[in-house]
Interface confidence: low
């Protein structure tokens, strides 16, 4: 038996994928642990091995089907339980009951490409994946430019509080390298968290025409 | 501010029909995904479907699935519940309720609630 204190928390990406993390003090490393998901009112149920990701804490995925299908909706509630090998049997670790369009965490933002850049301003648009049609409009954004000498956690969040797919980025200085990134929200959930930051996107504004301004 | 009128409850007998109307005033109905709710005597308010913003999405309760449909005309301002094949268990106060978000089946996440529509069905 492993003791301390455990957290089990998952998230729903809106279409066909639940990711899990598992963690759990004093846990052996190599233990054998699963995720178990049982859907009150679907057919099918849906397991994954969870993986070491630290120390104490495992992760996986479970892949409900196509990754564009809508295989849960509100109404639905999923049981989660983490199973842990001991022995010849399989101990139950941790138990949920899950609603998915309370935690939801859409996956990051993709194609992201520039469609117009300048000498002080750039255009860039971007797509959501696997997102559900249920959703509509009901999605907002934030997005962060990384400026020369700067880290990430230095860049001002820039907030769509709209489905806006695309974004100008104004006040930039010319012939410099930038590099963008946007994430994803549902209005939607309870527990509903941002996305990951989508890949960043590398750019550079136009130089300054000679003899003129800047 | 924003008002909800429901119409059209009534007696009928198992097994009968009725269609529900909603309209909604004093804001743009069109941006706004709307919720059907029922309450029975001496039980909680229970969801019983939901209508996305362009009519496009629907969702139902289990025990309303392929007996109820959720319609919208946002010319009209107005939402409809087609109820089918109705059944005893049925008979409760039903209202209609505005909310931003469309996947919402609690009552908390709801704003504004007309005043209910009287359904018996009589066995």
């Known amino acids: 038996a492993v003791n301390g204190t455990s957290q089990f928390t998952c998230f729903y990406n809106s279409r066909a994928n639940i990711s899990c993390v598992w963690s759990q003090d004093g846990a052996l490393q190599d233990t054998s642990c699963q995720v178990h998901a049982w859907p009150d009112r679907r057919r099918w149920n849906q397991t994954c091995e969870l993986l070491p990701v630290s120390q104490a804490s495992w992760a996986c995925n479970l892949i409900l089907g196509a990754p564009d299908s809508q295989k849960l909706t509100t109404v639905d509630i999923v049981t989660l339980r983490v199973l842990c090998r001991e022995g010849v049997r399989w101990r139950v670790m941790a138990i949920q009951d899950f609603k998915p369009f309370e935690n939801l965490r859409l996956m990051a933002p993709i194609s992201l490409q520039v469609v117009h850049v300048e000498t002080h301003r750039c255009n860039i648009s971007w797509e959501i994946s696997q997102a559900s049609h249920y959703f509509e409009r009901h999605l907002e954004f934030e997005a962060r430019t990384l400026s020369p000498g700067h880290t990430w956690e230095e860049a001002p969040l820039l907030t769509l509080k709209q489905k806006q797919e695309w974004i100008c980025l104004e006040t930039l200085t010319p012939d410099t390298q930038y590099e963008f990134q946007v994430r994803v929200k549902p209005l939607q959930g309870e527990f509903t968290t941002w996305s990951p930051w989508s890949q960043p996107l590398a750019f550079r504004t136009k130089p300054a025409a000679l003899g003129k301004d800047t | 501010e924003v008002q909800l009128v429901e119409s059209g409850g009534g007696l009928v007998q198992a097994g009968g029909s009725l269609r529900l109307s909603c309209v909604a005033s004093?804001?743009?109905?069109?941006?706004?995904?709307m919720g059907w709710f029922r309450q029975a005597p001496g039980k909680e308010r229970e969801f019983v479907g939901i209508?996305?913003?362009?009519?496009?999405?629907?969702d139902y309760a289990d025990s309303v699935k392929g007996r109820f449909t959720i319609t919208r005309d946002n010319a009209k301002s107005t939402v409809y519940l087609q109820m089918n094949n109705l059944k005893p268990e049925d008979t409760a106060v039903y209202y209609c309720?505005?909310?931003?978000?469309?996947?919402?089946?609690?009552?908390?996440?709801?704003?504004?609630w007309g005043l209910g529509t009287l359904v018996t069905v009589s066995s």
């Open positions: 004093g804001r743009t109905f069109s941006a706004t995904n």
């Open positions: 309720a505005l909310g931003r978000d469309y996947f919402a089946t609690d009552t908390r996440q709801y704003n504004y």
């Open positions: 209508i996305s913003e362009s009519g496009r999405n629907t």
